[in-house]
């Protein structure tokens, strides 16, 4: 019907609509590495999954160029604050790409959550949610930096985590 | 031309691409049952609809399996606090499913807004807002539960918030 | 075959596929009018961009009908609080549509963010992050105010952002 | 059922500290603030401060500030409030009162505790 | 701090009778639609207790003959039909914002 080439490739949209890139990788024990890298995830167990993207040391790697609407939360929490800690916390989304030399700032906040929990030595907790969507192309990665990462409070994957999906 | 079958499904998917399963709840003065169950939402009037997914006791119930970006925010606020800067809010989502006997934390923040009240006016507001990508299959349902609720504060469908769509 | 009209619309879905509305705009340093206005964005410089929406006076304006995931983050903060400042900052994201004379609160969120400084170090940061899927007609419009901007502090694009996708 | 005792009445001396007590039960301690306020003869009712059970944290009334302490001892449910630099003025009936389920009223409270001042 | 202002000071009024209390606030006490403001009885040797919490609501076990309204700064207590148990003083307080403060109280007495 002179259409083949075409209707092949509509019939392969079609199910790799089912397999638009998407990943949501978890907090673990492993994530806070205390080197100044980013924070490693868990990728496989639980609720963390990678359907068209890659993970390479704590990044998220595009195989398919786009805009991907990218996300991590991230638990704070701690009793007091520790000693020197200067009074912002700061959580961010970092572009690696062979294109520079340096990571690009995607999204960032800060936050003071120690706030008046110092007078005491209270506990406190607090949350930092981050999303928006960003271009990637082919092997370019993305990672999640929190500093001061002791402030970073992991259990079971659910209080920090990261990902992404194609839009 | 022998892609009769291929053809239609085809046609249905492109129709569906505008149904792709959506919905947005929002905060009524019935959320809060204090009851120790999930927050109700408002599925209809306003800002709230469904579109490919179901509605059920404080539920978002998947009518299609797949990956779903599912979210929730949350209003907090108060005059003071029931335990003062101990006081800790657990706002998250949660998995029923026929699988477990149990709800399966799937995102969950913990934060302490008490702190955020000057000195002598005890009004506070916070706002917690999580979003993910998590799987479902057909039947499965997510809740939204917040626990202290007496800190959620309802208006009019614009602060407290509960919302999935298909990635 | 019979199946052309139909063929060349899903031909050109599948293209305009990689085309989904899609936008991320990011704070600048004409962000702030002062004026009561909404914030205003920047559209084309760094990791802003439009792909199938608009952008008028600070507004998204929708080019399709359908339902949108949009979103917000401001990033706050300050040395104490101005002076005659409410407890209460107000982050929100609001529709215009022609069937209204005033803009329509979509998502909103309020946050005490000053009760974070500490007793001696006044300094604070706080962010504030909003999404939700609401639908936009042909020509509708969404824009972010925030109620004190003087607490919101622009820097790269990074910390303040808007942005939505079609889902 | 919920029940606030109070310690008995005190004569005190001016420059004197005196310190009530106010032992719970019938509920989930730690679960409610404790307040306490005072009525002076003659006069209305005076909020002193607050203290939450759970962690200690304390709350004053400005005008009893340097002078008041509030403690908790959770082993036996107790809270107590102890005044320093006692003046006649301070002679008053003193009541904890429980903060509520919404926390921002007090729906049960002490018998008193009549606190004389004299010298 | 928030000063509350109660009249009259004593109100005569026979059994069976309706009465009216006001408080007034010198600022508003609302917060999120919610008025932050509560009446407490007290008769003589007795502890205080609770009526109405957050201006309107009844306390558990308080008679139905016992209400509140108002918002912002005025604020009412109406004891529809006056039992011989109700002769008391009643005050208002506000609790939105440290200190804690009271009215000065109002007497009701038999007429």
């Known amino acids: 019907d002179g259409h083949g080439g075409s209707w092949e490739q509509l019939i392969q949209e079609r199910r790799s609509h089912q397999n638009n890139p998407a990943a949501h990788l978890t907090g673990a024990n492993s994530s806070l590495t205390g080197s100044g890298g980013p924070l490693l995830w868990e990728t496989q167990l639980g609720l963390a999954f990678l359907r068209g993207l890659d993970y390479h040391d704590g990044a998220l790697v595009a195989n398919k160029a786009g805009y991907y609407y990218i996300y991590s939360k991230v638990q704070l929490g701690g009793v007091g604050c520790p000693l020197g800690l200067a009074s912002t916390i700061t959580h961010g989304l970092y572009k690696r790409t062979p294109r520079y030399p340096e990571e690009l700032e995607l999204l960032v906040s800060q936050q003071s959550p120690c706030g008046r929990a110092t007078s005491n030595s209270r506990v406190w907790w607090d949350s930092s949610f981050l999303g928006g969507v960003v271009h990637l192309e082919v092997g370019e990665e993305v990672v999640v930096r929190v500093l001061d990462e002791r402030l970073v409070r992991l259990r079971d994957g659910t209080r920090s985590y990261f990902g992404a999906f194609m839009v | 031309d022998g892609h009769g079958g291929s053809w239609e499904q085809l046609i249905q998917e492109r129709r569906s691409h505008q149904n792709n399963p959506a919905a947005h709840l929002t905060g009524a003065n019935s959320s809060l049952t204090g009851s120790g169950g999930p927050l109700l939402w408002e599925t209809q009037l306003g800002l709230a609809f469904l579109r490919g997914l179901d509605y059920h006791d404080g539920a978002l119930v998947a009518n299609k399996a797949g990956y779903y970006y599912i979210y929730s925010k949350v209003q907090l606020g108060g005059v003071g606090c029931p335990l003062g800067l101990a006081s800790t809010i657990t706002h998250g989502l949660y998995k029923r499913t026929p699988r477990y006997p149990e709800e399966l934390e799937l995102l969950v923040s913990q934060q302490s807004p008490c702190g955020r009240a000057t000195s002598n006016s005890r009004v506070w507001w916070d706002s917690s807002f999580l979003g993910g990508v998590v799987h479902l299959e057909v039947g499965e349902e997510v809740v939204v539960r917040v626990l202290d609720e007496r800190l959620v504060r309802l208006r009019d469908g614009t602060r407290s918030y509960f919302g999935a769509f298909m990635v | 075959d019979g199946h052309g009209g139909s063929w060349e619309q899903l031909i050109q879905e599948r293209r305009s596929h990689q085309n989904n509305p899609a936008a991320h705009l990011t704070g600048a340093n004409s962000s702030l009018t002062g004026s009561g206005g909404p914030l205003l964005w920047e559209t084309q410089l760094g990791l802003a961009f439009l792909r199938g929406l608009d952008y008028h006076d600070g507004a998204l304006v929708a080019n399709k009908a359908g339902y949108y995931y949009i979103y917000s983050k401001v990033q706050l903060g300050g040395v104490g609080c101005p002076l005659g400042l409410a407890s209460t900052i107000t982050h929100g994201l609001y529709k215009r549509t022609p069937r209204y004379p005033e803009e329509l609160e979509l998502l909103v969120s309020q946050q005490s963010p000053c009760g974070r400084a500490t007793s001696n170090s006044r300094v604070w940061w706080d962010s504030s992050f909003l999404g939700g899927v609401v639908h936009l007609e042909v020509g509708e419009e969404v824009v972010v105010r925030v109620l004190d901007e003087r607490l919101v502090r622009l820097r790269d694009g990074t910390r303040s952002y808007f942005g939505a996708f079609m889902v | 059922q919920v029940q606030l005792v109070q310690s008995g009445a005190e004569v005190k001396k001016p420059g004197a500290s005196v310190k009530v007590s106010c032992k719970a039960s019938?509920?989930?301690?730690?679960?409610?603030?404790m307040n306490w306020v005072r009525k002076a003869p003659g006069q209305g009712l005076e909020w002193i401060g607050r203290?939450?059970?759970?962690?200690?944290?304390?709350n004053y009334n400005q005008k009893f500030m340097g002078r008041v302490t509030f403690t908790v001892d959770r082993s036996t449910s107790t809270v107590y409030m102890e005044l320093s630099s006692l003046r006649s003025e301070d002679t008053a009936v003193y009541y904890c009162?429980?903060?509520?389920?919404?926390?921002?009223?007090?729906?049960?409270w002490g018998q008193g505790t009549l606190v004389t001042v004299s010298s | 701090e928030i000063v509350m202002t109660q009249s009259p000071a004593t109100l005569s009024v026979s059994p069976g009778e309706r009465a009216t209390l006001s408080c007034k606030a010198s600022?508003?006490?609302?917060?999120?639609?919610?008025?932050?403001m509560n009446w407490y009885q007290q008769k003589p040797g007795q502890a205080p207790r609770l009526l109405i919490y957050s201006a309107s609501n009844l306390e558990s076990g308080i008679p139905a003959r016992f209400s509140g309204s108002g918002s912002g700064t005025e604020f009412t207590l109406t004891i529809s039909s006056l039992q011989s148990e109700d002769f008391a003083v009643y005050y208002c307080q506000q609790s939105i914002e440290d200190p804690w403060t009271f009215g000065q109280g109002t007497k009701v007495e038999i007429k």
């Open positions: 009162g429980r903060g509520s389920y919404y926390w921002n009223a007090m729906d049960y």
């Open positions: 019938g509920y989930t301690f730690i679960d409610h603030i």
């Open positions: 600022q508003s006490v609302d917060f999120d639609g919610e008025s932050y």
């Open positions: 203290i939450y059970p759970v962690s200690g944290e304390t």
